[in-house]
């Protein structure tokens, strides 16, 4: 009967998925930068703010050269899932002071979800382990005060900005290895 009929190409392949992840990360980085600037204008920050529940920054400029595809994608996915949780928490528990930023926070959450789906698709296509390493999930209680939610928002947006910044560099570097 001759060779079997082939399958038509699907919409993307791993390299295209990686390109798409880079574009989505860049776009999310721009959104985060803009929202962080809006926050600073509306609620000036008195120094740097931190939240114990946020992930620690995964990469530094010095470690970029030794990046491996599985490690970067797994860590990025875990960190972004944590930031997604924090953005959802901000929208839910941020209080009246952050209500004015609700449309922007909603758009940020939607973009984060889209990037996470793209990373998951990429990891599936590459058959990389997807199970997140067991990390204790710190429960997010309501902010102690209105000022507490503003400080939390500064910390979340600042941390997300740094994470996305290394993510863009890391993903671009990984493109050369796929």
């Amino acid at each position: 009967p001759g060779p079997p009929a082939g399958s038509p190409r699907v919409s993307s392949d791993p390299r295209a998925d990686l390109d798409s992840a880079v574009l989505l990360t860049r776009s999310l980085l721009a959104d985060t930068r803009q929202l962080a600037a809006q926050m600073r204008d509306k609620f000036p920050a008195d120094g740097d703010h931190s939240l114990d529940s946020l992930p620690t920054l995964a990469m530094s400029a010095g470690t970029l050269g030794s990046l491996q595809l599985p490690g970067v994608l797994t860590r990025l996915r875990v960190d972004l899932m944590s930031y997604l949780r924090h953005v959802q928490w901000l929208r839910r528990a941020g209080g009246p002071s952050l209500k004015t930023l609700e449309p922007e926070l909603g758009a940020l959450q939607a973009r984060l979800e889209r990037l996470l789906r793209r990373l998951q698709l990429l990891m599936s296509r590459l058959a990389l382990p997807q199970a997140a390493p067991d990390q204790p999930v710190i429960p997010l209680g309501p902010p102690a005060s209105a000022w507490g939610s503003i400080r939390a928002a500064h910390a979340i947006l600042g941390g997300l900005h740094l994470t996305l910044d290394w993510a863009v560099r890391g993903l671009l570097l990984l493109k050369t290895r796929l």
């Epitope: 699907v10 392949d13 789906r117 599936s124």
Partner: antibody, heavy 114, light 111 residues
Framework: EVQLLESGGGLVQPGGSLRLSCAAS????????MHWVRQAPGKGLEWVSV????????YYADSVKGRFTISRDNSKNTLYLQMNSLRAEDTAVYYC???????WGQGTLVTVSS | QSVLTQPPSASGTPGQRVTISCTGS?????????VNWYQQLPGTAPKLLIY???ERPSGVPDRFSGSKSGTSASLAISGLRSEDEADYYC???????????FGGGTKLTVL
């Protein structure tokens, strides 16, 4: 056009061995994780094993762990499944599949019977 | 027994809309993993129909759509045609397996 062509199936006695191959063309084989999925006659799909795009990660269903070994040769665009200690319940059509899986071969029939 | 649960059969008349459900657990769909759907026509290999919950590969008609919520997903087929008569399988990555799990399959009959 993507093509995945399985070979190596056939009739084997219980306890015997077989090696399945899957020749890939029409896509960048080395960028895709590859799976083996099987389907017993008249039954549903059962995932068997997966190997990552570069061969560094390999996972198996509990039902074949310790008996089957997945491997790949990216220079030859070929995926393999070494099947040892075969049992009657391993009788199935074995499909090789790429990616999500996005692409599937036509399958090769493995019959384990005395 | 399959890890993802699907109804064994579904049916509809030409032009109708049919929905096939797929229920998972906290280690697969509930863990946030995306759901893919496959169509297997009689005597042929499975074909990817929907990936990432609701994305269609090129060539798949927009009559096919997918959705996901919590630990469940569903495939909807509108404007049912006789050529849609096939087995449909859902699949999702599973943490405990480090691989995809499949539903038991749903045989769709076009009356």
């Amino acid at each position: 056009e993507v093509q995945l062509l399985e070979s190596g199936g056939g009739l084997v006695q219980p306890g015997g061995s077989l090696r399945l191959s899957c020749a890939a063309s029409g896509f960048t084989f080395s960028s895709y994780g590859m799976h083996w999925v099987r389907q017993a006659p008249g039954k549903g799909l059962e995932w068997v094993s997966v190997i990552s795009y570069d061969g560094s990660y390999k996972y198996y269903a509990d039902s074949v762990k310790g008996r089957f070994t997945i491997s790949r040769d990216n220079s030859k665009n070929t995926l393999y499944l070494q099947m040892n200690s075969l049992r009657a319940e391993d009788t199935a059509v074995y499909y090789c599949a790429a990616g999500v899986p996005d692409y599937w071969g036509q399958g090769t029939l493995v019959t384990v019977s005395s | 027994q399959s890890v993802l649960t699907q109804p064994p059969s579904a049916s509809g008349t030409p032009g109708q809309r049919v929905t096939i459900s797929c229920t998972g657990s906290s280690s697969n769909i509930g863990a946030g993993y995306d759901v893919n759907w496959y169509q297997q026509l009689p005597g042929t290999a499975p074909k990817l129909l929907i990936y990432s919950n609701n994305e269609r590969p090129s060539g798949v008609p927009d009559r096919f759509s997918g959705s996901k919520s919590g630990t469940s997903a569903s495939l909807a087929i509108s404007g049912l045609r006789s050529e849609d008569e096939a087995d449909y399988y859902c699949a999702a990555w599973d943490d405990s397996l480090n691989g995809p799990v499949f539903g038991g399959g749903t045989k769709l009959t076009v009356l």
